[in-house]
Interface confidence: low
């Protein structure tokens, strides 16, 4: 599923991401834009053999199990395939665990490079939330 910007903002708000660990909803929508272009089915292979999955490009080395990544920790205790669902519940729940891990949203390279320090509220402007 490819979400619309406001559609995703509403879904993320429903799942409790607005101001989760101090990160406003705009941060999460911005991260999703530059990680996956709002596509729940996005996958990207990394040079270490791990793969990033879903709308927030969650990594199989640490967070989910795809049965394919040597030394996977599966800290979210989910199959990576769950992160590709059009229902973003699994991705949101895992993202909450990631952002609580100590580095906050710096865990997402795209957020660090494209969203951090920018007017992230623009990503939810005009949305009826």
């Amino acid at each position: 599923k490819v979400f619309g910007r406001c559609e995703l903002a509403a879904a993320m708000k429903r799942h409790g991401l607005d101001n989760y660990r101090g990160y406003s909803l705009g941060n999460w929508v911005c991260a999703a834009k530059f990680e996956s272009n709002f596509n729940t089915q996005a996958t990207n292979r990394n040079t270490d053999g791990s793969t990033d999955y879903g709308i927030l490009q969650i990594n199989s080395r640490w967070w989910c199990n795809d049965g394919r990544t040597p030394g996977s920790r599966n800290l979210c205790n989910i199959p990576c395939s769950a992160l590709l669902s059009s229902d973003i519940t699994a991705s949101v729940n895992c993202a909450k665990k990631i952002v609580s891990d100590g580095n906050g949203m710096n865990a997402w390279v795209a957020w660090r490079n494209r969203c951090k320090g920018t007017d992230v509220q623009a990503w939810i402007r005009g949305c009826r939330l």
Partner: antibody, heavy 116, light 107 residues
Framework: QVQLQESGAEVMKPGASVKISCKAT????????IEWVKQRPGHGLEWIGE????????YYNEKFKGKATFTADTSSNTAYMQLSSLTSEDSAVYYC?????????WGQGTTLTVSS | DIELTQSPATLSVTPGDSVSLSCRAS??????LHWYQQKPHESPRLLIK???QRASGIPSRFSGSGSGTDFTLSINSVETEDFGMYFC?????????FGGGTKLEIK
């Protein structure tokens, strides 16, 4: 239960192309990788590559780049592998399998014979 | 690419014997090694995943061990239905690779 049903045997002429299909049932097709494996007598099993049907992401063994092309139709839960510029070296049994690192579920195999 | 070398190429045994098949990797692959059985004109069948975990429905006479570069598939008291080809496969890196196989035949 999980099943992978492959298309029937093919006899092709050198230089031609062929498209082999693999229809999946019994699981969520879009969220598991479909792997393709080649088996020739005396050459064992060779991994050709894989496709994630939901996203269209593909990864190929360097050896088969330019030879194999993977596609998937999520409306029919079917994965396809096209082999181009066929030669006698392409004569083999081709399997699809559901990828979990290991391959618990396999198709029955499609026998391809390339002969003039 | 990671090379997997299986030995012996052929093993001739009598039903009731216990046997060990070897698979050696060209570099360390942790426990990312899987074993398959294949009979003539059939698809491979997963026996053991991740070096030592029996796949669903596989009899307890099949067991796997090893880590790093050396792996063993053991069959305790071989039955007639166990004859065929056995392959190992690694999922530690891409491309996925298979061993050349061990043929288990009746003596």
């Amino acid at each position: 239960q999980v099943q992978l049903q492959e298309s029937g045997a093919e006899v092709m002429k050198p230089g031609a192309s062929v498209k082999i299909s693999c229809k999946a049932t019994g699981y969520t097709f879009t969220t598991y990788w479909i792997e393709w494996v080649k088996q020739r007598p005396g050459h064992g099993l060779e991994w050709i590559g894989e496709i994630l049907p939901g996203s269209g992401s593909t990864y190929y063994n360097e050896k088969f780049k330019g030879k194999a092309t993977f596609t998937a139709d999520t409306s029919s839960n079917t994965a396809y592998m096209q082999l181009s510029s066929l030669t006698s070296e392409d004569s083999a049994v081709y399997y699809c399998a559901r990828g979990d690192g290991h391959y618990c579920y396999w198709g029955q195999g499609t026998t391809l014979t390339v002969s003039s | 690419d990671i090379e997997l070398t299986q030995s012996p190429a052929t093993l001739s045994v009598t039903p009731g014997d216990s046997v060990s098949l070897s698979c050696r990797a060209s570099q360390s692959i942790s426990n990312n090694l899987h074993w398959y059985q294949q009979k003539p004109h059939e698809s491979p069948r997963l026996l053991i995943k991740y070096a030592s975990q029996r796949a669903s429905g596989i009899p307890s006479r099949f067991s796997g061990s090893g880590s790093g570069t050396d792996f063993t598939l053991s069959i305790n008291s071989v039955e007639t239905e166990d004859f065929g080809m056995y392959f190992c496969q690694q999922s530690n890196s891409w491309p996925r690779t298979f061993g050349g196989g061990t043929k288990l035949e009746i003596k």
